[in-house]
Each structure stands twice: as structure tokens, then as C-alpha cells.
């Protein structure tokens, strides 16, 4: 959480983002919430980039003002109009690229103040992971499967029974790089499975980490999965 | 049709505190501001701050910061102003009033409810 | 803050008179870049909650009878009863919402003779 408070002739206003990541090829947010003011005209939002001439976005007069806004933004941004009055001044980011990675600083002016924070947006691919019983396998084999991941990321596997145990010697982990060629598809193997016993396989790099779970018992399969964003920080 | 419906009267004792609790029907609870009101016979009506349940985003008068604190449960679609140190300067009725439907502006306060009687008295 | 001062602090008249009162800002509550006062009135019945009459200075709230008709601009406002009814029986209040915090008149009590 990072927390700005402007310094100007008239008062300083608080502005507050989180830091976040974008999942490449999807729509993202970058958090900025701020002290609003009365009247929306008397609201001045501007998001810029680290490293970037241009504008990200512009919403001024209760309405976007897209002239001076940078070519690789363009069609791609937009505000929440009708949350600027109670203070979001967050954006919406059309189809997140790599290069959307960065410091990024949201800048408010209202009639009281000004104010500003900044924020670290990091770009890549994360999903959830499935696990499921291979029955093809000549063995009791589990198979995790999530469908799109970069950077490249760890795959680690954990049994409930056999806690702390290194599945490292009975799991073999492949990854295949998808049709755009940046993000890859994340496969892992577990063999030598027993049945009533609850298995994890957990996939992390910097930006996210998920982790699919799946009971196995006589009479029946249970499943669950669950994704988290990394250093998700307010400023 | 949209409702407010506010809690009980409130007998304190100075140096307390007291929640008070405001549920809406009949509207989307997480789309307006919810302000709250003072009705005292000294001051007239003075604005205490409103509470946008959809982010739980505040917006306190100046006077009021710090006395008090508004909150917001969406699953029961309430909203609860919590009030702290209590004076005989707070015994008034308190009204929570929703906001307008407007985007540029969160007022003028369209719905009221019924309002809840606080009276501070050792 | 705005002060709003509202005149006459209370008033009796006839069913069928024609009422006006007054409400004024000490600063002006015309904002230029919309050409609109951000200004209320609201009706409170004895023993009720306020009710909102009028706002941007003259536009009704739906559901308010017409005879309840509010002008004004800048610093000056006013709201007009063209006809009493007995149950017009309220205080009424303007409130400013140019710039926080939003304020409130003092009120005008109108009584029915």
C-alpha cells in the first residue's frame, strides 16, 4: 500500500494505490483511491508511466481528455466515471501486455489539493491449476495441469499424509510454450500415488502462485484451487 | 421501494461509545452513498460523512474525525456508524440519508430513515 | 464552511396563501463549469424525517406536487408554496452541496393559521 500526500500552494490530499499484477492478454486494474472532492468537474486524474512521454490516461472535467495520451495506451484505458466522485480513481487496462510492467503514479488534483503515489504494476500469466487422476498411467498417477503461466514457474508437489515429504523423485514437470510464444503451459506428473490422502501441487513464480488440491478415496475424487497475486502492496 | 430502516434509541453514558445501525432495501446497497445526519435542537442538521459500501471508501466532516466511524456489510446490506467519547453535545437524533443517483455529484440525500434518538446522561 | 441563512425563522399563514421563503450563502453556489447551484430544499414534518423537495435550486423531486417551486442563483435562493395546504405544516431547510462539508439552513417553520 503506498500512500501519497500532495505538496502544493493549497492542501495536500491523500492518494492511495496498491500494487498489482496483470495477467497478459487479459484486462487488468491499477488501484488508486483518493479524497474526493464535491463536484466531479473540480476532479483531475492523470495516470503516467515510468519511462513514458506520453499520458497513460486522463479524466478531467468528469470526462476523459485522451489528446496528449501515449500511442501504446491508446484504446486501452479507462476510468471508473462513475466511482471518481467517491474518490476510485482506479484504471482499467485493456488487454495487458509484457510491456505494461512498470512504475506507474496516479496524480490527483481536486480543489482542495493535490496528491500523487505511485505503484508497481507487474505483468505475466498465471491460472489455476487442475489435478486429476491419470488413468491412462500404468501406475496411481496424478496429472496438474494450468494452462498458462510466464515467467517460468517452480511446480512443487505435498501430500497431506506425508507432510515435508520431496516429491521431487516421483514427479516429473514439463512445460510447452504456447501458440503466441510467451506463455507456456505448465504439466506435471506424480506417481506412485496412495488413495485416501489429499495432494497439492503448487505452481509460483513472482507475480502469482496457485495451488490445486485433490482427495483421493475409494468412492470418490474432491477437488479445489486456489490462485494468489505475489506483493500485492499499498502505497 | 427503497427503505431505511435505522435502530432503536440509545441511552449512554458520557465517555461511551455507541454503534448505530442503518439497513437498506428496495435499491443495489453497493451503487449509492450512505451519509448520516445530526439532528440536534442547538445545531439544526449538520452532515457527519457518508460511506460508499461498493469500496468502503469514507468521507468525514472535519468536525466529526475521529468521533466518528462508518462502516459497511454488504452481505446484509447495512451500514453502522459507530460513535466514540460521547458528550452531552451528542445527544441528537441521527438520521442516515442515501445519495443521489447522480455521477457528478453524491448529493442531495433523496431517501432518510426514520432516525434514532441518542441521548447521552450520566 | 458555507452558512446558510434562511428567512423568516417562521411564518403563519391561511390555506390558499402563497408562501415564500428565503435561503442565502455566504459564498456563491453557482459553479460556472455547469452552469448549476448546487443547492437543496427539504421538507421535515413534525415528528418525520426531512423529505427532498427541490434540488440543482429548481428541479422537483419526483413525486412533489408543483406548488413547490424553487428559484433563485448565486447567493439567493428562494422557495415558493403558490398554494398552502394544511399539510405544507413543516420546517423547511436549504442545504449547499458546492463544497464540503455540506451545510444546512437553520430552517423556516411554516404554521397554518
Known amino acids: 500500500l503506498i500512500i501519497g500526500f500532495g505538496i502544493s500552494g493549497r492542501h495536500s490530499i491523500t492518494v492511495t494505490t496498491v500494487a498489482s499484477a496483470g495477467n497478459i492478454g487479459e484486462d487488468g486494474i491499477l488501484s488508486c483511491t483518493f479524497e474526493p472532492d464535491i463536484k466531479l468537474s473540480d476532479i483531475v486524474i492523470q495516470w503516467l508511466k515510468e519511462g513514458v512521454l506520453g499520458l497513460v490516461h486522463e479524466f478531467k472535467e468528469g470526462k476523459d481528455e485522451l489528446s496528449e495520451q501515449d500511442e501504446m495506451f491508446r484504446g486501452r484505458t479507462a476510468v471508473f466515471a462513475d466511482q471518481v466522485i467517491v474518490g476510485n480513481a482506479s484504471l482499467r487496462l485493456k488487454n495487458v501486455q509484457l510491456t505494461d510492467a512498470g512504475t506507474y503514479k496516479c496524480y490527483i488534483i481536486t480543489s482542495k489539493g493535490k496528491g500523487n503515489a505511485n505503484l508497481e504494476y507487474k505483468t505475466g500469466a498465471f491460472s489455476m491449476p487442475e489435478v486429476n487422476v491419470d488413468y491412462n498411467a500404468s501406475s496411481e498417477t496424478l496429472r496438474c495441469e494450468a494452462p498458462r503461466w510466464f515467467p517460468q514457474p517452480t511446480v512443487v508437489w505435498a501430500s497431506q499424509v506425508d507432510q515435508g515429504a520431496n516429491f521431487s523423485e516421483v514427479s516429473n514437470t514439463s512445460f510447452e510454450l504456447n501458440s503466441e510464444n510467451v506463455t507456456m503451459k505448465v504439466v506435471s506428473v506424480l506417481y506412485n500415488v496412495t488413495i485416501n490422502n489429499t495432494y497439492s501441487c503448487m505452481i509460483e513464480n513472482d507475480i502469482a502462485k496457485a495451488t490445486g488440491d485433490i482427495k483421493v478415496t475409494e468412492s470418490e475424487i474432491k477437488r479445489r484451487s486456489h490462485l494468489q497475486l505475489l506483493n500485492s502492496k499499498a502505497s | 421501494q427503497v427503505q431505511l430502516q435505522e435502530s432503536g434509541p440509545e441511552l449512554v453514558k458520557p465517555g461511551a461509545s455507541v454503534k448505530l445501525s442503518c439497513k437498506a432495501s428496495g435499491y443495489s446497497f453497493t451503487d449509492y452513498t450512505m451519509h448520516w445526519v445530526k439532528q440536534s435542537p442547538g445545531q439544526g442538521l449538520e452532515w457527519i460523512g457518508w460511506?460508499?459500501?461498493?469500496?468502503?471508501?469514507?468521507m468525514y466532516n472535519d468536525k466529526f474525525k475521529g468521533e466518528a466511524t462508518m462502516t459497511a456489510d454488504k452481505s446484509s446490506s447495512t451500514t453502522y456508524m459507530q460513535l466514540s467519547s460521547l458528550t452531552s453535545e451528542d445527544s441528537a437524533v441521527y438520521f442516515c440519508?442515501?445519495?443521489?443517483?447522480?455521477?457528478?455529484?453524491?448529493?442531495?440525500?433523496?431517501?432518510w430513515g426514520q432516525g434514532t434518538l441518542v441521548t447521552v446522561s450520566a | 464552511d458555507i452558512v446558510m441563512s434562511q428567512s423568516p425563522s417562521s411564518l403563519a399563514v391561511s390555506v390558499g396563501e402563497k408562501v415564500t421563503m428565503s435561503c442565502k450563502s455566504s459564498q456563491s453556489l453557482l459553479y460556472s463549469s455547469n452552469q448549476k447551484n448546487y443547492l437543496a430544499w427539504y421538507q421535515q414534518k413534525p415528528g418525520q424525517s426531512p423529505e427532498l423537495l427541490i434540488y440543482w435550486a429548481s428541479t422537483r423531486e419526483s413525486g412533489v406536487p408543483d406548488r413547490f417551486t424553487g428559484s433563485g442563483s448565486g447567493t439567493d435562493f428562494t422557495l415558493t408554496i403558490s398554494s398552502v395546504k394544511a399539510e405544507d405544516l413543516a420546517v423547511y431547510y436549504c442545504?449547499?452541496?458546492?463544497?464540503?462539508?455540506?451545510?444546512f439552513g437553520a430552517g423556516t417553520k411554516l404554521e397554518i393559521k
Open positions: 440519508a442515501r445519495g443521489g443517483d447522480s455521477i457528478i455529484t453524491v448529493f442531495p440525500f433523496t431517501y
Open positions: 460511506i460508499y459500501p461498493g469500496s468502503g471508501n469514507t
Open positions: 442545504q449547499q452541496y458546492y463544497s464540503y462539508p455540506p451545510t
